[in-house]
């Protein structure tokens, strides 16, 4: 069982793992999104554009992810079930200026089953 | 024997090797498809169009492949049989805009026979 204190859309169940969605404004063209569990950076995704508008995506921590024009979703196959953890997203906006950094709303995730297998329950 | 936790159409048996199919929407005109084994990129295929609509196919890792209008199939002649491995496809969509990157559903492949010779079994 999963408990999420954030908006339920932040967490969803996929193929035995958890998808954590980090939203950002559609006006943002170039960004860095990081997913934290407590103080630990689990995932980092950077999207930039070159002088010819070519897009570069860097995923140095090799996380499974999906990028759209207003969110980055990270897929955790083996979320830490030993204890409840607080997950949150940190957004760096490179473009449009000025440069900004902000922590997005987070959520508390607790996995009671030893494996995520069957269903997802959320309390808000 | 091969175990695949993904859609069985992702893996199929061909001439002593494995064909791994990576599906994409038919509307996609320009793309990059990468095949991962765990964190390692095994194959990469990029299809782009030039100003005169001439198609360019780049296959920098020199993989055997087949490209159709809705899938890229990569052929692995000697899949790593020392241990079970998780394979997945990563799709970058250049056209139509907006640019998107997404990791497609993957599958777990375990080869029990010393050689792939006779049949393919999949459990889902």
């Amino acid at each position: 069982e999963i408990n999420g204190s954030a908006d339920h859309r932040m967490f969803s169940f996929h193929n035995g793992g958890v998808q954590i969605s980090c939203k950002y404004p559609e006006t943002v063209q170039q960004l860095k999104m990081r997913l934290f569990r407590e103080r630990e950076v689990l995932c980092e995704l950077t999207k930039t554009k070159g002088s010819g508008n070519a897009v570069s995506i860097k995923n140095p921590m090799l996380c499974l992810y999906h990028l759209s024009n207003n969110s980055v979703s990270f897929f955790l196959n083996n979320p830490d079930s030993s204890q409840g953890s607080y997950y949150f997203c940190s957004l760096s906006i490179f473009d449009p200026p000025p440069f900004q950094e902000r922590n997005l709303s987070g959520g508390y995730l607790h996995i009671y089953e030893s494996q995520l297998c069957c269903q997802l329950k959320l309390w808000l | 024997e091969i175990n695949g936790s993904a859609d069985h159409r992702m893996f199929s048996f061909h001439n002593g090797g494995v064909q791994i199919s990576c599906k994409y929407p038919e509307t996609v005109q320009q793309l990059k498809m990468r095949l991962f084994r765990e964190r390692e990129v095994l194959c990469e295929l990029t299809k782009t169009k030039g100003s005169g609509n001439a198609v360019s196919i780049k296959n920098p890792m020199l993989c055997l492949y087949h490209l159709s209008n809705n899938s890229v199939s990569f052929f692995l002649n000697n899949p790593d049989s020392s241990q079970g491995s998780y394979y997945f496809c990563s799709l970058s969509i250049f056209d139509p805009p907006p640019f998107q990157e997404r990791n497609l559903s993957g599958g777990y492949l375990h080869i029990y026979e010393s050689q792939l010779c006779c049949q393919l079994k999949l459990w889902l």
Partner: antibody
Framework: EVQLVESGGGLVKPGGSLTLSCAAS????????MDWVRQGPGKGLEWVGN????????YYAPFVKGRFTISRDNAKKTLYLQMNSVKSEDTATYYC??????????WGQGTLVTVSS | DIVMTQSPSSLAVSPGDKVTINCKSS??????????LAWYQQKTGQAPKLLIF???TRHTGVPDRFMGSGSGTDFSLTINSFQTEDLGDYYC?????????FGPGTKLEIK
């Protein structure tokens, strides 16, 4: 302060080769796309090509046609332009530039390449 | 490739004059809310310097007498009160697609 310093220019014969370098300082080099822009004597600015942050992707102007290669060494904070099969029309001042997300916000002083027999 | 044109190619000006340089692209540079166009100044014997990005946003440290405007295919750079230190060549440049291209330049000279 952002600084870009080009070197390696000089006289080269048609068909010859030359490698230009650009030493970067004052910013996190590995966070930025980098470009080469050139300017022929008495002429305008012409984009040569660029390279992404980790050097995995490069793009080139049509006139390059496989003759030039852009690379980078992030550990050394250095950008390179390898020029092969040079022609007289490649005579120009070559500028190393930083793509600051939405424009070329920093330029080197330039290095002159003269192609002549 | 997108072709950039500029007019005039040269202009003789006096200190205090209002100066306007025009730039035209062969296709629209508007994407979302942004026009992918920048302006640069190049003084004799020096490297170019960024003045304006996204068609109308002044780069850090650029005096407010420099103003960029326009959208789509038609853009202009205005110097509201020309100073002698503004002498030089001015280039527009798009970054809408690869290759990014520059206009041929406009030279400002003293009248």
């Amino acid at each position: 302060e952002v600084q870009l310093v080009e070197s390696g220019g000089g006289l080269v014969k048609p068909g010859g080769s030359l490698t230009l370098s650009c030493a970067a300082s004052g910013f996190t080099f590995s966070d930025y796309w980098m470009d080469w822009v050139r300017q022929g004597p008495g002429k305008g600015l012409e984009w040569v090509g660029n390279i992404d942050e980790d050097g995995s992707t490069t793009y080139y102007a049509p006139f390059v046609k496989g003759r030039f290669t852009i690379s980078r060494d992030n550990a050394k904070k250095t950008l390179y332009l390898q020029m092969n099969s040079v022609k007289s029309e490649d005579t120009a001042t070559y500028y190393c530039t930083r793509w600051g997300r939405y424009a070329f916000d920093s330029w080197g002083q330039g290095t002159l390449v003269t192609v002549s027999s | 490739d997108i072709v950039m044109t500029q007019s005039p190619s040269s202009l003789a000006v006096s200190p205090g004059d209002k100066v306007t340089i025009n730039c035209k692209s062969s296709q629209s540079l508007l994407s979302g809310n942004y026009n992918y166009l920048a302006w640069y100044q190049q003084k004799t014997g020096q490297a170019p310097k960024l003045l304006i990005f996204y068609a109308s946003t002044r780069h850090t440290g650029v005096p407010d007498r420099f103003m960029g405007s326009g959208s789509g295919t038609d853009f202009s750079l205005t110097i509201n009160s020309f100073q002698t230190e503004d002498l030089g060549d001015y280039y527009c440049q798009h970054h809408y697609s690869t290759p990014p291209t520059f206009g041929p330049g406009t030279k400002l000279e003293i009248k």
